[in-house]
Interface confidence: low
């Protein structure tokens, strides 16, 4: 059982109240985390509650304000960035969101030495991306899809690229599909460690089909949004990587980095770039059929002023049972010799583990092993490697931080977090200062989140950075639901589940059950984290039991479970939710006549297929922004798991796995279909096609659209959405309003 925040039990039960929907919509019980903005081994910046930018020195214990809230307010700044030489700060304002990571903004440069904004050669607006060099105060920025360089903030800019064109050529920033499905960043440029070189990607979207949808706005005529968006099987962006010498940018100009021959022979992707030294860079490439990845280490040739990527420095990673990597192919963490590296990939038993690669992948030395998975390498120093895993006590939904002392042989391993606040904290991430001199631990639960600062040598806790005291006090009179994380063993498959139970749960009674599902490949829903959200309210106030189940296709439990869904999405994910529901019914406290399922995005797809499974298990269900056919979704994501929608590849399963193909099966369930009309990610087209199929089959259903809303359904739409879904479920479960 996962323990929720401890509270003083008051003998007067009436002082305790249930959660309300208003609590959730107002974010009354949201928590804070503290991630230091490290600027050296022992210093970090933090934006104080009153918006001053404060520099903290851990070793002297001193802190001082480097930038006042008055200066921030003078340009309505919402973000900042200190130059590494500490002479300048950029201030970011006029934030305007584009896609998941991307946004444009206006940037002002403040000179700390004279306390004034830099005048002359001001930056254009709006800028798509801006960053300091890692040393000094050079600036690189992207404006109108072209990259510019400034040697100093007050200098005139040097234009690096000239071919940038909206929706056609992207320099230094990704196009839609690379941003969402490959890089997971708003940028596609990378400074070398000392700022000598700048690497960048160029994406050519000229031949990509365009998704067009109406944005209604307030005008007489709606606008049309056009996005080059390659759906499964469509023409993909063409990517090239260039590197320019930033000291003498005009000398030879940008030099293209060659693509490995085995990759260039057919459609391919660039997946990431990692600088090793100022004159060595590592690029990762991926075949369009995403089971072969190549890591290529390239060196600068002074004599030719070019980048050389010898075949002997190409490392191939191939999957024979699924796709390469987990959600993404992992990135390397280089050691101090600047050629060997640490990387997470599947071992011979099919578990993702840390390997040390010195010459070839075949000769890799396995650093971690076991029937659990290494999840992230945080930092490698000369004597330690810090990583996270779900090894401890065999709970896949936990994250603990470990240190391996690589300076000694054999390397010894120690869990840094396993016994810190053990009941409260079982899911950690970490943030390290230079050379891992100090680090912050951020614990996400299952108790109230807490952020702490630690000595990197002894692991001693130095201080609490954020403990969410206000939240703890606010929850003292709240009847929170109980949470259990357990597992079901079914036909040699382990199904971990989280069950959220009403506060006065009584096993002898019968409760309505709501399944919340995501279920996408390499996802994980059953995690030991704290949350007070909509489903907490449904359990606390409305007396529902809510369950989340990680079935086949989910992550961090080995390749057998993960790759089970390869080339057949929409089958086992649904089967496993159904299997779990049957097991929950056997537990005796579920009202079989009141079972619902809901999900968003991939979860909307799974919930729709579960409702249309013909099992008769579900009375009703909700799909928010569902995928309805894999032919409608992005190439990079879809083809990773499904291959191509061609006759000689996997077209048959693309056709068999649609929601529309099961329209008839919705006849005996109550179905609520919800979608935003301006969804750039899972296009409204998906729900439009479900609705059309249901109408054609003369099946009744309920629907709600959110005009001009994207995949996140944010702002006032969120309130409307959850209120609407609550009414729907209460009606389905015959609960009074």
């Amino acid at each position: 059982i996962v323990l929720r925040p401890s509270r003083v039990h008051n003998s007067e039960e009436n002082t305790m109240r249930a959660l309300t929907l208003k609590d959730i919509l107002n974010g009354t019980f949201s928590y804070k985390t503290f991630f230091p903005n490290w600027i050296s081994g022992q210093e970090y910046l933090h934006q104080s509650a009153d918006n001053n930018i404060v520099l903290y020195n851990i070793e002297t214990g001193q802190s001082y304000t480097i930038l006042s809230n008055r200066t921030m307010k003078s340009v309505n700044a919402s973000n900042y960035g200190l130059s590494p030489d500490r002479q300048f700060v950029y201030l970011e304002s006029d934030y305007s969101k584009l896609w998941r990571y991307s946004y444009t903004a206006t940037y002002y440069i403040y000179d700390l030495s004279n306390g004034e904004f830099v005048r002359g050669n001001e930056l254009p607006r709006p800028i798509q991306y801006l960053c300091w060099s890692p040393v000094g105060s050079k600036l690189a920025y992207v404006y109108q899809n072209n990259i510019y360089l400034k040697q100093r903030p007050g200098d005139p800019p040097f234009q690096i690229t000239f071919n940038g064109r909206e929706n056609k050529i992207f320099n230094g920033i990704p196009d839609w599909v690379y941003e969402e499905e490959m890089l997971a960043t708003k940028y596609a440029l990378w400074w070398s460690p000392n700022g000598k070189f700048l690497a960048y990607a160029e994406f050519n979207d000229t031949d990509i089909p365009v998704i067009a949808y109406s944005y209604y706005g307030d005008e007489q005529y709606p606008r049309t949004i056009n996005i080059p968006y390659p759906k499964a099987g469509a023409k993909n962006p063409v990517v090239r990587i260039f590197i320019i010498d930033t000291t003498y940018p005009a000398y030879v100009g940008p030099q293209e980095v060659p693509v490995p021959a085995m990759i260039a022979s057919s459609d391919y992707y660039f997946s990431w770039l990692t600088w090793v030294t100022d004159e060595r860079v590592c690029l990762q490439w991926l075949k369009r059929v995403q089971n072969v990845s190549v890591l290529s280490i390239c060196d600068f040739r002074e004599d030719w002023q070019t980048w050389d990527c010898p075949k002997t420095q190409e490392h191939i990673e191939e999957s024979r049972t699924g796709w390469a990597g987990g959600f993404f192919v992992s990135t390397p963490v280089f050691s101090y010799d600047a050629i060997s590296y640490y990387k997470i990939f599947s071992d011979k038993d099919g578990y993702k583990h840390i390997h040390y690669i010195k010459d070839t992948v075949e000769n890799a030395i396995q650093i971690t092993s076991g029937k659990w998975e290494a999840i992230n390498i945080f930092r490698v120093t000369q004597d330690s490697l810090f990583y996270s895993s779900n090894e401890f006590e065999e709970y896949p939904g936990r994250r603990n931080i470990y240190r391996i002392s690589i300076g000694s042989y054999p390397p010894s391993k120690k869990c840094v977090t396993c016994h810190l606040r053990k009941e409260r904290c079982q899911y950690y991430t970490a943030s390290f200062s230079d050379y891992a001199k100090y680090y912050a631990l951020v614990c996400y639960g299952p108790g109230i989140p807490i952020s702490t600062l630690h000595d990197g040598r002894t692991d001693q806790e130095i201080k609490i950075l954020e403990e969410n005291k206000e939240l703890e006090n606010a929850l003292k009179n709240i009847q929170l639901p109980k949470e259990e994380i357990k597992k079901l063993e079914v036909d040699e498959i382990t199904l971990w589940y989280k069950m959220i139970l009403p506060p006065q749960f009584d096993r002898s009674k019968k409760y309505p059950l709501l399944i919340q599902v995501y279920g996408g490949p390499c996802s994980q829903s059953v995690r030991s984290v704290f949350a007070v959200n909509w489903i907490s309210y449904l359990a606390s106030k409305e007396g529902m039991v809510i369950a989340l189940v990680d079935g086949r296709g989910t992550a961090f439990q080995g390749d057998k479970l993960l790759y089970a869904v390869y080339r057949k999405l929409g089958v086992y994910e649904v089967e496993d939710q159904i299997t779990a529901v049957r097991k929950f019914i056997e537990m005796g406290f579920i009202d079989e006549k009141r079972i619902a399922i809901w999900g968003w995005s991939y979860g909307g797809y799974v919930s729709s297929l579960a409702l249309a499974s013909g099992t008769g298990l579900f009375k009703c269900g909700i799909a928010v922004a569902p995928v309805s056919s894999w032919e409608y979704y992005a190439s990079v994501y879809t083809e990773r798991f499904m291959g191509l929608p061609t006759k000689d590849d996997n077209l048959e399963h693309y056709k068999n796995s649609t929601v529309m193909a099961r329209a008839e099966y919705f006849r005996n369930v109550d179905y609520l279909l919800i979608h935003g009309t301006a969804d750039d990610n899972v296009h409204f087209q998906n729900s439009a096609q479900i609705a059309k199929a249901l109408v054609n089959a003369q099946v009744d259903f309920q629907a709600m659209w959110y005009s001009d809303q994207n995949h996140g359904l944010s702002g006032l739409s969120t309130n409307h959405l959850y209120t609407h879904m609550t009414h729907f479920l209460k009606q389905c479960f015959s609960l009074s309003d």
Partner: antibody
Framework: DVQLVESGGGLVHPGGSLRLSCAAS????????MSWVRQAPGKGLEWVSG????????YYTDSVKGRFTISRDNSKNTLYLEMNSLRAEDTAVYYC?????????????WGQGTTVTVSS | EIVLTQSPGSLSLSPGERATLSCRAS??????LAWYQQKPGQAPRLLIY???TRATDIPDRFSGSGSGTEFTLTISSLQSEDFAVYYC??????????FGGGTKVEIK
């Protein structure tokens, strides 16, 4: 020389209480995890309780949970063990010990021990 | 909790002989194992930590080896002051810190 000196032991009736102290000298006390280890007459070593440098975490062996409380005062370089509801089986020599710094946590400095006798 | 089993329970040897003491862990503990020496009426003294690293001022006739579940303390040539009880201790997964039952090395 790094030293640990325990005090506070003695004869006590079952159900009674005692408070042991351990005074540390010549090392940065606050940086180190400290533990109490006991040894019943003619028996082996048994770890009883531990406390982290900043007192953030306290640890106990199952048999003393709820009865014993470990604490420390870093300003006084002193470690304490408050023992309540004492039983005959708590009779032992109690040692305080300093742990090494990460990653080993072996106990590199021990006090000379203080004797606790629980008898009616 | 991790259980440490020491063998043999006691060992009768003459000065100058080699002593080999064994410690087995109920589950793998990497090299998070220490060895202590205790003489009658005295507090334990740290000999070895990290399975094989000698503590400060410990003579080189004491050596430790092993990793995982099997560990050995070797005293290459017993001196009269080495006759004592030896304990192994794990700190891989704690709390609780656990000790082995001890091996008594006595004069033959």
């Amino acid at each position: 020389d790094v030293q640990l000196v325990e005090s506070g032991g003695g004869l006590v009736h079952p159900g009674g209480s005692l408070r042991l102290s351990c005074a540390a000298s010549t090392f940065t006390f606050a940086n180190y995890i400290m533990s109490w280890v006991r040894q019943a007459p003619g028996k082996g070593l048994e770890w009883v309780s531990g406390i982290t440098g900043s007192s953030t975490n306290t640890y106990y062996t199952d048999s003393v949970k709820g009865r014993f409380t470990i604490s420390r005062d870093n300003s006084k370089n002193t470690l304490y063990l408050e023992m309540n509801s004492l039983r005959a089986e708590d009779t032992a020599v109690y040692y305080c010990a300093k742990h090494q710094l990460y990653p080993y946590y072996a106990m590199d400095v021990w006090g000379q021990g203080t004797t606790v006798t629980v008898s009616s | 909790e991790i259980v440490l089993t020491q063998s043999p329970g006691s060992l009768s040897l003459s000065p100058g002989e080699r002593a080999t003491l064994s410690c087995r862990a109920s589950q793998p503990i990497d090299s998070y194992l220490a060895w202590y020496q205790q003489k009658p009426g005295q507090a334990p003294r740290l000999l070895i930590y990290g399975a094989s690293t000698r503590a400060t001022d410990i003579p080189d006739r004491f050596s430790g080896s092993g990793s995982g579940t099997e560990f050995t303390l070797t005293i290459s040539s017993l001196q009269s002051e080495d006759f004592a009880v030896y304990y192994c201790q794990q700190y891989y997964d704690w709390p609780p810190v656990t000790f082995g039952g001890g091996t008594k090395v006595e004069i033959k």
